[in-house]
Each structure stands twice: as structure tokens, then as C-alpha cells.
């Protein structure tokens, strides 16, 4: 059965939907099982950002190696995408040092190796090196290693303090180590450098050098101080034995790129900066750089998380003899997750996992129906996302509530205004042998011809116990049915609107009183089922005080059990 749309005009009853104890939406067909198959070759990481309540789901999924719970990849896993050259454009130009225009980030130079079956973090991958078979022609103020033919120029930084560690589950593709970088006039060489030499006794020696990418900056840049990291974890250490010009401080950049679907977590293990030195951390890979921290925030033990798969750290030091200061940071990749889905007003959400492949299921409170997807799946992406918008719970216009024990009936749109030209009918039916108590939480009708009728029976002709046309004041004690039914009727005309109504109901056994209720308060009872003789004592939440009614009420009259006093109300102090 499905709820029909509210009928236009008065006197027409809409379709009525039967439910068992709870009014819900007409069953929306479940979204078909998605065709997306979640596949990944990303390794299992110790996750640091999971919701504590979800621990059992995550751990279970990781132990199983369940592909459904691993991040979904919309592409074949290649090594982490190289940086596009837009690093840190928004960092403040501190101390009037040259604004960063680093030549280093786009690392097209590195040869691509076929993926091993271990995946993108295969521990077997090797550091790429640039093989130089002839001396490069020196450019203006270029610091170039002078090598003989056949020598290998390692791109590993001069001090082991800058080498990315590979302590984790292997390398993420390859440790994209720093390439040849420039100083002085700022000519950066990146790309594949190939040289060929032809020589003979009588021939002139010819050297051909191809430089694929050349970036030229016209400002005087600090020393060669830029590294790229792309393993799942590594160490970022301050440079210690860089030979740099005596009149310039360091301006160093550490670029971290982990697998899409992961974020970068940086932990400060040690930091000791000199006056005037700065360290700034930004998240990259999103639409805009995301400032994450600076030296004033970077204290020992501090953890900074980039919600994107790329991050950059910039260190600016003083010129000798004063500097530089030192630091030791450790970074690691952490699995990104979807945001916790918003709980719909008048509904709830159950989440299996916030990580890609996880799902969120929504349902609505009695009297509301779900508008939108009942089931969302977390999809993998650079920033994982839910595959649909969060649904909302909309108040239904009418319905049948069988086995009504406790719940609420609310008018369409509540707590917002109802619409015009509605005729909504609700039938409440208590379990066999029980009666109903109906309590008015709120009734707000437009002054014109909008009308709420509550009938003591199961049909539109049953005599009313409340009719807004005829009754000026709401009974604070609520209403009791003489049998097991209440029939609620809301009709609105073509003009004016108000918030409508919220009615709370509860069933109670014959020979018993109904369960008391106090908003913004609580009560204790001498007996849980409220037979004759039960006493109930009320109290209010902090900031509220008891008004009207009595603090203690008693269930009296064996022939027609009822509370001897009305329930009190708790009002804000």
C-alpha cells in the first residue's frame, strides 16, 4: 500500500496506509545493487581516524581483507599523481622573502615502472636515478655536479636526514626522491635528462643534452631545498648540511603525496626553531590550498591532518651564522572517510562504516516518511563521498497505526506550517484489550476554517472527544479513548496556515492508568505498569521548574482508573 498524495478539497479522505506499530513511508524500492565493484590494491593501514563506535566494523573489514570495505578506486592504481605546479600559492610571503615559484613539483622526470602485483606500494620498487653520460653545459650560476662520463648522479639529498623512511607497508609506487634542483638564478631541471656522446680520433666530440622541463625564475632563490615523498609514511627532517650561499637563509619545501582516498597525517616528533624561522603546513590536492598549521601551532606531539592526499611543508630559516633550527616530523597516510551522515530530524541513521564501501541506512520516526534514498554508500574518491544526498523525514498526511503502543502523530510539514487544502485521517489502534491516551504536545491552527477533530472510535462518524471548532482550550491532561481506537482528522482550507499539531499517544491496559509524561523533565513510579494505587513523582531538568498539576500523582478508581491530578509541566526558569 502506498500513501496517496493529500487530496485537494475537503471531505475527501486520502488513502490510508497500514503499518504495524509504526507509520513509515510507503516502501520505496531499494536502490538496485550498484554496479560499481569496489576494487583496490591499497594496503591495509592502521587507521587513525575511524569513529570509535565503528571500530568493530573497520577492524573486521580489514582483517577479512574484504574488498567491499577497502577504498574503491575509480581507476587502475598508478603511482600517486605527481604534483601539479601550484604549490602553496597562498602562503604568506614572510619576511619579504621571494614568493615561492618552485620548479620542483611536477615530477614527470621519473621513469614509470610497470606495477607489480603487490600494488602501488610495492616494497620492491627502486628509487629512480638520473643517469648522466656527459657533463651538462653549465648555465648561468648553476650548481651542477661535475661528473665524468658514465658516472651516476644520485638524486638522494646530501644528508641522510632528508631521506624518506620506508618503515610502513612498503613504498607507494616509488619514493619520488628529490630531483636535481637549482640554486642561484633559479634554473630548475626536471624531466628526463638524456645525453649522447660521439667520439673518434679525428672527430670533434659532440654532446647533446635534452632538458624536458626548464623553469626559470628571475628572483634570487635560497638554496636547493626541496623534496618529494610519496610512500605511505616517512620522516621529514630539517636540512643539516646543505651548502648554501652565506647571505641567504633556507627556503625548503617538503611535498607529500599519498594514494588518493588517503589523507596525510603529520606528527611533530621534535621541533626547535630559532627566532624568526617559520614552518607552515598546507593541504594540497583540493580546489584551493588548505592552511593547516604554522610554527606557533607545531608543538611536540602535535598531529596535523590534511583531509586531502597531498600536503606541503615549508621551512624558512635564517641565514648563517644564526640558523637553521631543527625539526623532526613523521608523516603517514590515513584512510579518508565520508563525513558522518546528518541524522534526519524525526528520524535516525545507522552507519556500518564511514570508509569507502560502508553504508548508512535511514529511517523515520512514527508519523514521518522518508524523502530521498533510504540507503547511502560511501564511494571512494580523493575525498570520499556518499552516493546520494542525506534524506529527510517528512510528516505524513494520515495513515493507520496498528498495535499503537507509543508514538506521535504530526501534521504534514511539522514543525513548519502545514499546506492548504489538506484532509488527513489517522487511525490509531491500541493492542487488544488496551486503550489509548492522547496528549497534545502542540496544536496551532490558522484562525479561519482549519480544523482538528479527534474521534472516539475508528471512523469519520464516531463522536468526537476533541473538535477545534467547538473547544476553546486544549485539555492539559490529554484524552482517553473508551475503546482501542482514536480517529484523528485534520482538514485545512485554501487560506492561512500554521504549525499544525503534534500529538503523542500511548496505549495502556484496562485497569491501569496511562504512562505519565513530562516534557523537559522526568518521573519515578512505584510500579512500572501503573495499576491502581501507583504513585508517580515528577522532577524537571536543570533550568526548568514544575508548574501546574502536582509533583506526586496517584492512579485511582478501580472501575475507571485515572490519575487523581493532572501531570505537571516543566517551564524554563
Amino acid at each position: 500500500l502506498s500513501l496517496e498524495a493529500p487530496t485537494v478539497g475537503k471531505g475527501q479522505a486520502p488513502g490510508i496506509e497500514e503499518t504495524d506499530g509504526e507509520l513509515t513511508a510507503a516502501p520505496t524500492p531499494e536502490q538496485p545493487e550498484r554496479g560499481v565493484h569496489f576494487v583496490t590494491t591499497a594496503p591495509t593501514l592502521k587507521l587513525l581516524n575511524h569513529h570509535p563506535l565503528l571500530e568493530e566494523f573497520l577492524q573486521e573489514g580489514l582483517e577479512k581483507g574484504d574488498e567491499e570495505l577497502r577504498p574503491a578506486l575509480p581507476f587502475q592504481p598508478d603511482p600517486p599523481a605527481p604534483f601539479t605546479p601550484s604549490p602553496l600559492p597562498r602562503l604568506a610571503n614572510q619576511d619579504s622573502r621571494p614568493v615561492f615559484t618552485s620548479p620542483t613539483p611536477a615530477m614527470a622526470a621519473v621513469p614509470t615502472q610497470p606495477q607489480s602485483k603487490e600494488g602501488p606500494w610495492s616494497p620492491e620498487s627502486e628509487s629512480p636515478m638520473l643517469r648522466i653520460t656527459a657533463p651538462l653545459p653549465p648555465g648561468p650560476s648553476m650548481a651542477v655536479p661535475t661528473l665524468g662520463p658514465g658516472e651516476i648522479a644520485s638524486t638522494t639529498p646530501p644528508s641522510r636526514a632528508w631521506t624518506p623512511t620506508q618503515e610502513g607497508p612498503g613504498d607507494m609506487g616509488r619514493p619520488w626522491v628529490a630531483e636535481v634542483v637549482s640554486q642561484g638564478a633559479g634554473i630548475g631541471i626536471q624531466g628526463t635528462i638524456t645525453s649522447s656522446t660521439a667520439s673518434g680520433d679525428d672527430e670533434e666530440t659532440t654532446t647533446t643534452t635534452t632538458i624536458i622541463t626548464t623553469t626559470i625564475t628571475t628572483v634570487q632563490t635560497p638554496g636547493p631545498c626541496s623534496w618529494n615523498f610519496s610512500g605511505p609514511e616517512g620522516s621529514l627532517d630539517s636540512p643539516t648540511d646543505l651548502s648554501s650561499p652565506t647571505d641567504v637563509g633556507l627556503d625548503c619545501f617538503f611535498y607529500i603525496s599519498v594514494y588518493p582516498g588517503y589523507g596525510v597525517e603529520i606528527k611533530v616528533q621534535n621541533i626547535s626553531l630559532r627566532e624568526g624561522e617559520t614552518v607552515t603546513v598546507e593541504g594540497l590536492g583540493g580546489p584551493d590550498p588548505l592552511p593547516l598549521a604554522n610554527q606557533s601551532f607545531l608543538l611536540r606531539g602535535q598531529v596535523i591532518r590534511s583531509p586531502t592526499h597531498q600536503a606541503a611543508l615549508r621551512f624558512q630559516s635564517l641565514p648563517p651564522p644564526a640558523g637553521p633550527g631543527t625539526f623532526h616530523f613523521h608523516y603517514q597516510a590515513y584512510l579518508l572517510s565520508c563525513h558522518f551522515p546528518r541524522r534526519p530530524a524525526y528520524g535516525d541513521v545507522t552507519v556500518t562504516s564511514l570508509h569507502p564501501g560502508g553504508s548508512a541506512r535511514f529511517h523515520c520516526a512514527t508519523g514521518y516518511q522518508l524523502k530521498g534514498a533510504r540507503h547511502l554508500t560511501c564511494l571512494n574518491a580523493t575525498q570520499p563521498f556518499w552516493d546520494s544526498k542525506e534524506p529527510v523525514c517528512i510528516a505524513a498526511c494520515g495513515g493507520v497505526i496498528r498495535n499503537a503502543t507509543t508514538g506521535r502523530i504530526v501534521s504534514p510539514g511539522f514543525p513548519g506550517n502545514y499546506s492548504n487544502n489538506l484532509t488527513c485521517h489517522w487511525l490509531l489502534e491500541a493492542p487488544e484489550g488496551q486503550r489509548l491516551h492522547l496528549h497534545f504536545e502542540k496544536v496551532s491552527l490558522a484562525e479561519d476554517d482549519d480544523r482538528l477533530i479527534i474521534r472516539n472510535g475508528d471512523n469519520v462518524e464516531a463522536p468526537p472527544v476533541y473538535d477545534s471548532y467547538e473547544v476553546e482550550y486544549l485539555p492539559i491532561e490529554g484524552l482517553l479513548s473508551s475503546g482501542k481506537h482514536f480517529f484523528v482528522e485534520l482538514s485545512t482550507d485554501s487560506s492561512g496556515a500554521a504549525a499544525g499539531m503534534a500529538l503523542r499517544y500511548e496505549a495502556f491496559q484496562q485497569g491501569h492508568c496511562y504512562e505519565p509524561f513530562v516534557k523537559y523533565g522526568n518521573f519515578s513510579s512505584s510500579t512500572p505498569t501503573y495499576p491502581v494505587g501507583t504513585t508517580v513523582e515528577f522532577s524537571c531538568d536543570p533550568g526548568y521548574t514544575l508548574e501546574q498539576g502536582s509533583i506526586i500523582i496517584e492512579c485511582v478508581d478501580p472501575h475507571d482508573p485515572q490519575w487523581n491530578e493532572t501531570e505537571p509541566a516543566c517551564r524554563a526558569v
Partner: nanobody, 124 residues
Framework: HVQLVESGGGLVQPGGSLRLSCAVS????????MAWFRQAPGKEREGVAV????????YYADSLKGRFTISHDNAKNSLYLQMNSLRAEDTATYYC?????????????????WGQGTMVTVSS
Amino acid sequence: HVQLVESGGGLVQPGGSLRLSCAVSGFTSSRGWMAWFRQAPGKEREGVAVIGRRSGDIYYADSLKGRFTISHDNAKNSLYLQMNSLRAEDTATYYCAVGDQAGHVLTSSPYRYWGQGTMVTVSS
């Protein structure tokens, strides 16, 4: 000060008819219920019929439908009960009541004001 005065009761033979009237004064609300109740000797008071002042909605006790008719005249502020095909079991004191509170309209709970009653006897 609200006052209700019933009239029209008396002795009638089975199968006969009677028309009861209730003059209401002091009740100025445009809304509320106006009802007829009856109480037979040795029995509890029971609702006979009710009419809404604003809505004009009418409700009867199940056992009486078809024989009794309730009506009211707003201009005269009067309530009427037309009783046809009277039976011996209709013998009772008939009361007029008005009220604007919530409650089962065919029970006494919504009614704040009551008349003194008029006696109807159905006997041959």
C-alpha cells in the same frame, strides 16, 4: 451567569411524540457543545444527542438513531429534541447541557452547565 431551563416534558403513550426545548441564557460563546442527556430511575445518566454550536455537527447515542432529532436555533439561543416513536424505556428525566471543553461528547465530561431537567413518562 449561565442558565438552562428545559420544558416540554410530560406523559405520553408508547408510539407517541414529544418535543423538548431548552432556553439557554448567559452562554455567549459561538462555539461549544449543546446536548441532551437522560437519567432513568436507578440508572446512570446517559448521552442522548449533541450538536456543535459552530460546526452544526450532530451525534446520537447508537440506540436512539432514527427516532430522536436534535436541533438548535442560534437566534433564540434554544436547543430542541424531537422524540418520535416513544417507548416505555424512554421514560427518564431529560437534561439540557452546554460546554466547550474536550471530552467524549456523549458523556458528561465536556459540559460545565446543566439544566434542572424535565420529566418524560411513556406509559399506556
